[in-house]
């Protein structure tokens, strides 16, 4: 029941990180006072307790929520439009990869699609990020902190993608 997530997805994930690095407009050092611990749910991305379909659901959730976060009017006003479009393209590619993978994975079996608690934990993480941006009035430094946080979360989720690759 393997799917071709391996090659396409990890490549796109690396490109996403590169684009996010290029998106940085101000020095992170000038935003030290705005630093915040959003409580990235690392345990949801360790991949030990997951079936493949559930791992796909969690990864999809993180990427979709990232796409939502960066496709708001406030985001468009902050980031370079060309880089933002490249960013969207990579996120969309990853969502498509995961969706195609899930289609193959669930087939017609009653494979559990998700662990609801895991999905809700990821959503609450993004809600904390959105609340932070709102409280900081979407300031340039607030966005810089969020950009760094999303880069970190993408890096940390790579562990689950690796496990997905090997899990047949």
């Amino acid at each position: 029941l393997g799917c071709d997530l391996p090659q396409t997805h990890s490549l796109s994930n690396r490109r996403t990180l590169m684009i996010m690095a290029q998106m940085g407009r101000i020095s992170p050092f000038s935003c030290l006072k705005d630093r915040h611990d959003f409580g990235f749910p690392q345990e949801e991305f360790d991949g030990n307790q997951f079936q493949k379909a559930q791992a796909i659901s969690v990864l999809h959730e993180m990427i979709q929520q990232t796409f939502n976060l960066f496709s708001t009017k406030d985001s468009s006003a902050t980031w370079d439009e060309t880089l933002l479009d490249k960013f969207y393209t990579e996120l969309y590619q990853q969502l498509n990869d995961l969706e195609a993978c899930m289609m193959q994975e669930v087939g017609v079996e009653d494979t559990p699609l998700m662990n609801v608690d895991s999905i809700l934990t990821v959503r609450k993480y993004f809600q904390r990020i959105t609340l932070y941006l709102t409280e900081k009035k979407y300031s340039p430094c607030a966005w810089e902190v969020v950009r760094a946080e999303i880069m970190r979360s993408f890096s940390l989720s790579a562990n689950l993608q690796e496990r997905l690759r090997r899990k047949e």
Partner: antibody
Framework: EVQLLESGAEVKRPGSSVRVSCRAS????????ISWVRQAPGQGLEWMGR????????NYAQNFRGRITITADKSPLTAYLELSSLRFEDTAVYYC???????????????????WGQGSLVTVSS | EIVLTQSPGTLSLSPGEGATLSCRAS???????LTWYQQKPGQSPRLLIY???SRATGVPDRFSGGGSGTDFTLTISRLEPEDFAVFYC???????????FGQGTKVEIK
């Protein structure tokens, strides 16, 4: 909650084109696709195509390829359906529809239509 | 391409009775990608059930979805006057994305 508001009714001649608009408001994201679904009088629902406004990426149903163009503006979030070479059988109510960001998990979100416009009646008549 | 066939075409029942609507796919569909809608005359469709069996927000628990493979059902345990409408099943397949609707089942007052 997302609200979808479509443009008004249209009467068109066979062979001409029609353009229907759908403006989204409320908790909208350009990261979710907006679809067009039509319903001929007394008939069922038929998916025509969709667009991802953030990128302008489109997917069209086989039946409409060559006659359909879906476009979108990101601000204000608006989708447009253009159908050309109109025939009498294109007389229908045209709905725009979108997923919900609240569906759990998100991977199911784009597989369904949680929000619908009020419908726009297009009549093809000579 | 998947074809969804709904039966019966029309169901004549009285309020308080139960209803079972069928949706049969021409090929296997994962229950996760099967959705049900309700449409009343002159209104837009309304999402009822998604993922085969999950009720959408605000949908009463008298509505339930089930089935797998090629055979799916929408069950209304006790019909209320406001339940009489046309019901559509819809499947999703990707890539590329394709949404397919059944032709509908009309539930009318006997």
């Amino acid at each position: 909650e997302v609200q979808l508001l479509e443009s008004g009714a249209e009467v068109k001649r066979p062979g001409s084109s029609v353009r229907v608009s759908c403006r989204a408001s409320g908790d909208t994201f350009s990261s979710y696709p907006i679809s067009w679904v039509r319903q001929a009088p007394g008939q069922g629902l038929e998916w025509m195509g969709r667009i991802l406004p953030a990128l302008g990426v489109t997917n069209y149903a086989q039946n409409f390829r060559g006659r359909i163009t879906i476009t979108a503006d990101k601000s204000p979030l608006t989708a447009y359906l253009e159908l050309s070479s109109l025939r009498f059988e294109d007389t229908a109510v045209y709905y725009c529809a979108s997923p919900s960001a609240d569906i759990i998990p998100s991977i199911l979100g784009t597989t369904l239509f949680a929000f619908w416009g009020q419908g726009s009646l297009v009549t093809v008549s000579s | 391409e998947i074809v969804l066939t709904q039966s019966p075409g029309t169901l004549s029942l009285s309020p308080g009775e139960g209803a079972t609507l069928s949706c049969r796919a021409s090929q296997n569909v994962s229950r996760h990608y099967l959705t049900w809608y309700q449409q009343k005359p002159g209104q837009s469709p309304r999402l009822l059930i998604y993922g085969g069996s999950s009720r959408a927000t605000g949908v009463p628990d008298r509505f339930s979805g089930g089935g797998s493979g090629t055979d799916f059902t929408l069950t209304i345990s006790r019909l209320e006057p406001e339940d009489f409408a046309v019901f559509y099943c819809q499947s999703y397949h990707s890539p590329p994305p394709v949404y397919t609707f059944g032709q509908g089942t009309k539930v009318e007052i006997k």
